[in-house]
């Protein structure tokens, strides 16, 4: 058993049929010695008396808010949550496995640049009695500060018969050094509490590995005189790190015909303009990636050829 | 060729070669996402490789003030990695094929470090640890960790040379 926060305790349980559970001793936070009784949640049933209460926690029915009273007045509360361990593995019932980039990916994180700011998100099908808290640091043995904002419900989607909820959080490294080579990874820890179930999820990454630039902006087409070719140009996204001579991007461009099956020729360039043949009804697209480190490509930015 | 005493390196040449290094480092180990390197023991096997840190003057402002600190750091790192890529970690089993990008990577690291070598001036370099793993699979793990680390190192170096070529070239 360990204290999650004041008056909230997590009981770690090996979860299998007929498991013995954990013996927990609760102490009433009061100078009083006599006449103390204990109840669980809203039930008025007295579970025991005395300054301490010893209980055997085996299942969710044994978890909840224990209150000690004297003369009808509540003296203190202890909320017990359960953290299940099945076959040596902590339960992951609350969040959905996003399976990208690999199995058992519950938290996904992205950064738009090297400023030390990043966003993490996760998915669940649970809609009520659910709370999250997030902590983050750089490194674990001698952690350096990362400040995270409030968790927000960022999207709701219908997946077949189920509704899926996406939660996200934004974090910022306190003393970011965009030009340096990261040596220690960022650690993100998410505590999830659903009713009386506690779970925790972690992710560890370097900012450089979660970089995904915003799409290039200001796509423009300029037809060339007496030619089927057009000059296309674009700009670095506003959110990308500066100066661009240092934090450079590379681009992938393609012209996509109306039919999705039509062959797309992709061209890679470090420049912010190119000359292409852009037929009527086709569209021109461009995406960006860090020029020197193979992190994610941005989403495509597109403009019709006509 | 480059940096005699305290003058500027051949920024454009260094830019080209460092960008080539980035490409080679990724072609040598593109499988990053499919492998759980942590599963094989969390102890940081590449902790003793040189990193370009905040105080090394490799940011745009630091380069404008005095690029020498940064260039020295980059050169130390290049020599360190060049030695690692020539060690038993990469020459032992499982063997790399003769046309493996690691061979070209090794040669390019040497080439860039020589571009940064001042005439008649030898910067001191870090002692190269040569941990020779007893198990071939540990050698493979070390290779992957070294290449991951090298990818990050050469990315910073390439940014430095790109910025230098754009803003500091005579």
């Amino acid at each position: 058993i360990w204290e999650l926060k004041k008056d909230v305790y997590v009981v770690e349980l090996d979860w299998y049929p007929d498991a013995p559970g954990e013996m927990v001793v609760l102490t009433c936070d009061t100078p009083e010695e006599d006449g103390i009784t204990w109840t669980l949640d809203q039930s008025g049933e007295v579970l025991g008396s005395g300054k301490t209460l010893t209980i055997q926690v085996k299942e969710f029915g044994d978890a909840g808010q224990y209150t000690c009273h004297k003369g009808g007045e509540a003296l203190s509360h202890s909320l017990l949550l359960l953290h299940k361990k099945e076959d040596g593995i902590w339960s992951t019932d609350v969040l959905k496995d996003q399976k990208e980039p690999k199995n058992k990916t519950f938290l996904r994180c992205e950064a738009k640049n090297y400023s030390g700011r990043f966003t993490c998100w996760w998915l669940t099908t649970i809609s009520t009695d659910l709370t999250f808290s997030v902590k983050s640091s750089r490194g674990s043995s001698n952690p350096q500060g990362v400040t995270c904002g409030a968790v927000t419900l960022s999207a709701e989607r219908v997946r077949g018969d189920n509704k899926e909820y996406e939660y996200s959080v934004e974090c910022q490294e306190d003393s970011a050094c965009p030009a340096a080579e990261e040596r220690l990874p960022i650690e993100v820890m998410v505590d999830a509490i659903h009713k009386l179930k506690y779970e925790n999820y972690t992710s560890s990454f370097f900012i450089r590995d979660i970089i995904k630039p915003d799409p290039p902006k200001n796509l423009q087409l300029k037809p060339l005189k007496n030619s089927r070719q057009v000059e296309v140009s674009w700009e670095y996204p506003d959110t990308w790190s500066t100066p661009h001579s240092y934090f450079s991007l590379t681009f992938c461009i393609q012209v996509q015909g109306k039919s999705k099956r039509e062959k797309k020729d992709r061209i890679f360039t470090d420049k912010t303009s190119a000359t292409v043949i852009c037929r009527k009804n086709a569209s021109f697209s461009v995406q960006a990636q860090d020029r020197y480190y193979s992190s994610s490509w941005s989403e495509w930015a597109s403009v019709p050829c006509s | 060729r480059a940096v005699p005493g305290g003058s500027s390196p051949a920024w454009a040449q260094c830019q080209q070669l460092s960008q080539k290094l980035c490409t080679l480092a990724w072609s040598a180990h593109p499988l990053v996402g499919h492998m759980d390197l942590r599963e094989e023991g969390d102890e940081e096997t590449t902790n003793d490789v040189p990193h370009i840190q905040c105080g090394d003057g490799c940011d745009p402002q630091g380069l404008r003030d005095n690029s020498q600190f940064c260039l020295q750091r980059i050169r130390q790192g290049l020599i360190f990695y060049e030695k690692l890529l020539g060690s038993d970690i990469f020459t032992g089993e499982p063997s790399l094929l003769p046309d493996s990008p690691v061979g070209q990577l090794h040669a390019s690291l040497l080439g860039l470090s020589q571009l940064l070598q001042p005439e008649g001036h030898h910067w001191e370099t870090q002692q190269i640890p040569s941990p020779s793993p007893s198990q071939p699979w540990q050698r493979l793990l070390l290779r992957f960790k070294i290449l991951r680390s090298l990818q990050a190192f050469v990315a910073v170096a390439a940014r430095v040379f790109a910025h230098g070529a754009a803003t500091l070239s005579p």
């Epitope: - | 499988l31 492998m35 759980d36 020459t91 499982p94 063997s95 094929l97 198990q135 699979w137 290779r143």
Partner: antibody, heavy 126, light 111 residues
Framework: QVQLVQSGAEVKKPGSSVKVSCKAS????????ITWVRQAPGQGLEWMGE????????YYNEKFKGRVTITADKSTSTAYMELSSLRSEDTAVYYC???????????????????WGQGTLVTVSS | DIVMTQSPDSLAVSLGERATINCKAS???????????LHWYQQKPGQPPKLIYN??KLESGVPDRFSGSGSGTDFTLTISSLQAEDVAVYYC?????????FGGGTKVEIK
């Protein structure tokens, strides 16, 4: 074609040594390793060790506690396995096999004992 | 040392039927969670062994009725439709850790 030809059968006294040779042909000797595997009569296979002429690395099964020495002569494309302090339980067929142990992007840890010698029967008897 | 335990010791299967051989390692023989350092060899009487399945990949020239599966510590070699020429002893071999170790062998016969 690739061939590994081993030396002939040997009868040895307990306490003595035996040196089995394995002559390779049909491929570049230094591009592959040579592994030694033994098989006692009616028993399974036992890995003894392997040598890689290119890197000069040799790996041994510690079970043989320094009794086994595996070498290679690049000039004659021949590998050798010497076993000393022989005892009766060393009676076995000794095989050499070509080992390809490579790392590519597609197969980062490819290991194959792809060609084998015909085997050398070593009998240890007083 | 990693101990490789094969089961069963011997197996009699009718022609055209499926034969399944198991190999259990005393510790994980996968690397990076995805690469299995586990191989299968076939040995016919009076012959040296022959590699048939390597790192979850059938060797060229080996009939596709042979297939390998498993990861971590538990592996299986399956012959989907046993043929007369498949009668042999089959060995698993791990090469994650020196000393590399073979399983004790499974003898496959025709019922």
């Amino acid at each position: 074609q690739v061939q590994l030809v081993q030396s002939g059968a040997e009868v040895k006294k307990p306490g003595s040594s035996v040196k089995v040779s394995c002559k390779a042909s049909g491929y570049t000797f230094t591009s592959y390793g040579i592994t030694w595997v033994r098989q006692a009569p009616g028993q399974g296979l036992e890995w003894m060790g392997e040598n890689y002429p290119r890197s000069g690395n040799t790996y041994y099964n510690e079970k043989f506690k320094g009794r086994v020495t595996i070498t290679a002569d690049k000039s004659t494309s021949t590998a050798y396995m010497e076993l000393s302090s022989l005892r009766s339980e060393d009676t076995a067929v000794y095989y050499c096999a070509r080992v390809e142990f490579i790392s590519t992007v597609v197969a980062p840890y490819y290991y194959a004992l792809d060609y084998w010698g015909q085997g050398t029967l070593v009998t240890v008897s007083s | 040392d990693i101990v490789m335990t094969q089961s069963p010791d011997s197996l009699a299967v009718s022609l055209g039927e499926r034969a399944t051989i198991n190999c259990k390692a005393s510790k994980k023989v996968t690397i990076f969670g995805s690469i299995s350092a586990l191989h299968w060899y076939q040995q016919k009487p009076g012959q040296p062994p022959k590699l048939i399945y390597n790192l979850a990949k059938l060797e060229s020239g080996v009939p596709d009725r042979f297939s390998g599966s498993g990861s971590g510590t538990d592996f299986t070699l399956t012959i989907s439709s046993l043929q007369a020429e498949d009668v042999a002893v089959y060995y698993c071999l791990q090469n994650k850790e020196v000393p590399y170790t073979f399983g004790g062998g499974t003898k496959v016969e025709i019922k």
